[in-house]
């Protein structure tokens, strides 16, 4: 039994919960922006349901989303990025629920990449570096990064460090010797834009040196 009504009878549809959330990604493909929306309830029957955005667009009044499995997606250059747009869930011509959203307040950055850790023996530290595509962007350039690391055996004991640069130094004495560590990083808009954390970068794994027994230092 579908959760929406067919044959023009929309009464059942209006009983369902069509709450949804969206995020934007600016300049995600050259000068193209994207907008992704999905229902909060994964059990919503999405057959015949469409998403539409109207307002704060360039040259057009409204745009329809493409459906990709359970998400709805637009990639376009036509977002004005000034003011509020109206995003609606529709069945046919009828709007079931709508949200007014400024697309610059729901920005989800792209995940950082090329995460690596280099051990400096002389300095007794580890230099963590990573890259972000946002350094080259016109709009969302300023990000806060969250570097998380843990000893591999401590499943939920993550240590987090927030930073605005793409380089972090971890002191050797703060880490356990002869241990395997996992490290990862994500980003969030920090200035001029608002939104959500990116996906995590792929994890990087590194091993700390053993302790040198004579000096009490790690090898």
């Amino acid at each position: 039994e579908s959760g929406y009504a067919q044959n023009g009878d929309l009464e059942d549809a209006e009983l369902d919960d069509y709450s949804f959330s969206c995020y934007s990604q600016l300049e995600v493909n050259g000068s193209q922006h994207s907008l992704t929306c999905a229902f909060e309830d994964p059990d919503v029957n999405t057959t015949n349901l469409e998403f539409e955005i109207c307002g704060a667009l360039v040259e057009v009044k409204c745009l329809n989303f493409r459906k990709l499995q359970e998400i709805y997606f637009i990639e376009t250059k036509k977002f004005l990025l000034i003011g509020k747009s109206n995003i609606c869930v529709k069945v046919g011509e009828k709007s079931l629920t709508c949200k007014k959203i400024d697309l610059t307040t729901i920005v989800k950055p792209e995940a950082p990449f090329d995460l690596s850790v280099i051990y400096r023996e002389g300095a007794n530290d580890f230099v963590v570096t990573f890259n972000t595509s946002h350094l080259q962007k016109k709009y969302v350039k300023v990000l806060m990064h969250d570097v998380a690391y843990r000893q591999e055996k401590d499943e939920n004991k993550w240590t987090h460090v927030n930073l605005s640069s793409t380089k972090l130094t971890l002191l050797q004495r703060k880490l356990q010797p002869a241990a395997m560590y996992e490290i990862k990083v994500r980003s969030i808009p920090d200035h001029y834009f608002k939104g959500f954390w990116s996906e995590w970068s792929p994890s990087y794994y590194f091993r700390t040196p053993e302790i040198n027994n004579s000096s009490g230092e790690m090898d």
Partner: nanobody, 118 residues
Framework: EVQLVESGGGLVQAGGSLRLSCESS????????MGWFRQAPGKEREFLAA????????HYSDSVQGRFTISRDNAKNTVYLQMNSLKSEDTGRYYC???????????WGQGTQVTVSS
């Protein structure tokens, strides 16, 4: 109710500059888009420039691109329009607007007169 008060208009010679200000009484100013428009005598009101809530995104009409600059100070609830290389056709009443919501500006000021003499 949001009130917008424009200032900075006046008489200026062609080629000169003016800086218009628009102060908002609105408590949501720092999250609202702002825009500038003008109405020349006997003509319809035309869009000039708009700026997003943070100032990061701006948009200009072709007629003022490169000559006018829109900016904002959220601490002062004020939006500005810096107008350079003014021409006689820039003469008109200049209005600011607040809260661009689904292609409609929700609030308007009373305007300030700009006259460019040649």
């Amino acid at each position: 109710e949001v009130q917008l008060v424009e200032s900075g208009g006046g008489l200026v010679q062609a080629g000169g500059s003016l800086r218009l200000s628009c102060e908002s009484s609105g408590s949501t100013f720092s999250s609202d888009a702002m825009g500038w428009f003008r109405q020349a005598p006997g003509k319809e009101r035309e869009f000039l420039a708009a700026i997003g809530w943070s100032g990061a995104v701006t948009h200009y009409s072709d007629s003022v691109q490169g000559r006018f600059t829109i900016s904002r100070d959220n601490a002062k609830n004020t939006v500005y329009l810096q107008m350079n290389s003014l021409k006689s056709e820039d003469t008109g009443r200049y209005y600011c607007a607040e809260d661009y919501d689904t292609d409609v500006w929700q609030y308007w000021g009373q305007g300030t007169q700009v006259t460019v003499s040649s």
